[in-house]
Amino acid sequence: VIHVTKEVKEVATLSCGHNVSVEELAQTRIYWQKEKKMVLTMMSGDMNIWPEYKNRTIFDITNNLSIVILALRPSDEGTYECVVLKYEKDAFKREHLAEVTLSVKADFPTPSISDFEIPTSNIRRIICSTSGGFPEPHLSWLENGEELNAINTTVSQDPETELYAVSSKLDFNMTTNHSFMCLIKYGHLRVNQTFNWNTTKQEHFPDN
C-alpha cells in the first residue's frame, strides 16, 4: 500500500502504478474507488467522475492512471483502490490492483490572542481565535492549570472546505497579574497560546 500525506491546501496525486496504451483503452475498464464508493470509472475510453469529485479531480491517464485531487478536503482521507480490468477471451479479467492511502492534514495554526479595554471599568477582554483545521476543535481557557469560564465560544465550519474556525472571549480583572492559556484540542492534537498581563507595566506579553 502506498501512503500519501498532503495538507488541505495542496494537490494530491494518487497513482495506480500501471500504464495502459491508448490502443488498449477500448478493451480496458478502470475503476477508482474509495472504501467501496466510486470515485471515477473509465470504460472503453468513456470517463465518468462521481459528483463529489467532479469539480476537482483530474484523471491523468498518461501518468500511471493517476487521479489528481485538486482541492483536498478532510473527508478525502482514506484508502483508495484502483482496479484495471482487461478484455481477454470473451471476458474482462483483472490485470492490476493497487491501493493508496491518503492522509489529509488540516492543522490549526497557533491561535492569536488580541485584547481590548472595556471603557469605564477595570475589566479587560481578550479574544483567542484560529481557523483552518479539522476535526472539530474544543477551546478552553486555563489559569494555573484550572479551567475558566469563557463569555462565549463560537465554532463554525465552512461547508465547502469542511474546515473549522474557533473563537472565544474571556474577561478578566486588570488590577491583578494574570497568565492565561488558550488551549485548543482537535482530534489527538492540540495548539495553545499564552497571554500574560502585568499590572505594574499595564502591558501584556503574548507567549510566542
Epitope: V8, K9, V11, N55, R56, I58, F59, D60, T62, V68, L70, A71, P109, S131, G132, D158, E160, T161, L163, A165
Partner: antibody, heavy 117, light 107 residues
Framework: QVQLQQSGAELVRPGSSVKISCKAS????????MNWVKQRPGQGLEWIGQ????????NYNGKFKGKATLTADKSSSTAYMQLSSLTSEDSAVYFC??????????WGQGTSVTVSS | DIVMTQSQKFMSTSVGDRVSITCKAG??????VAWYQQKPGQSPKTLIY???NRHTGVPDRFTGSGSGTDFTLTISNVQSEDLADYFC?????????FGSGTKLEIK
Amino acid sequence: QVQLQQSGAELVRPGSSVKISCKASGYAFSYYWMNWVKQRPGQGLEWIGQIYPGDGDTNYNGKFKGKATLTADKSSSTAYMQLSSLTSEDSAVYFCARSYGNTMDYWGQGTSVTVSS
Amino acid sequence: DIVMTQSQKFMSTSVGDRVSITCKAGQNVRTAVAWYQQKPGQSPKTLIYLASNRHTGVPDRFTGSGSGTDFTLTISNVQSEDLADYFCLQHWNYPFTFGSGTKLEIK
C-alpha cells in the same frame, strides 16, 4: 455571494512602491488561494503569484520574484500585493482572483497602476 | 513555462452562429484548463473549469472540451453580448499561464 473588492487606481513615481488591496467577502477567506494577475493595456493576462491566507504560504511566477510581495490579513479578510522599484513596465491593471482547486473562479474589479514622473 | 497558444487572434461570427475557439498547450496539461471571457473595461469572468465544466450561472451555449494539449471553447447560438476577448488558462504546472486571447467580433 463571493465578492472581491479592490482598492482604487494609483498614480505613482518611478522607483517607488505601491501596495494594493483586495477585500474578500462571501466565503471563508483563510481556506482558498488568492491569486494576482497583471494585464497591460490591450494585452493578455500574466499570473504573478498566489497566497494561502490560512498560513501565508506563497507561490510566485519567477518573473515577478523581487517585484511583487504577497501578504494577507485574515482578521480583515484582505489580501495585499506590494510592487517595488516601479518602472513604466509595471503600468497595468492588476486583478486579484480567488482559486478553488487551482481554477481562478471569482475575480476582483481590477486596480489600475500608472507609473509616471 | 508552459506556453498556451491561441492561434486565432480575431474571429468574426454572426448572431445565431456556432463558433469554436481553440487553445493549444505546449505540453500535456491533462484537463487542468479554464476559459475566461473578458469584456472591455471589465474583469475576466469564468466560463469553463477543468476543461469541460461550466461555471455557475454560465449559459449552456458555452461548452468546453479537450484534454492533454488541445482544448476548445465552443459557443453555439452566438449572442451579441458574447462580443468579448476569450482567454484559456493552464493550472497544471507553476507558473500558471494564459493564452494570448481571441477577440470575438460580431458581424
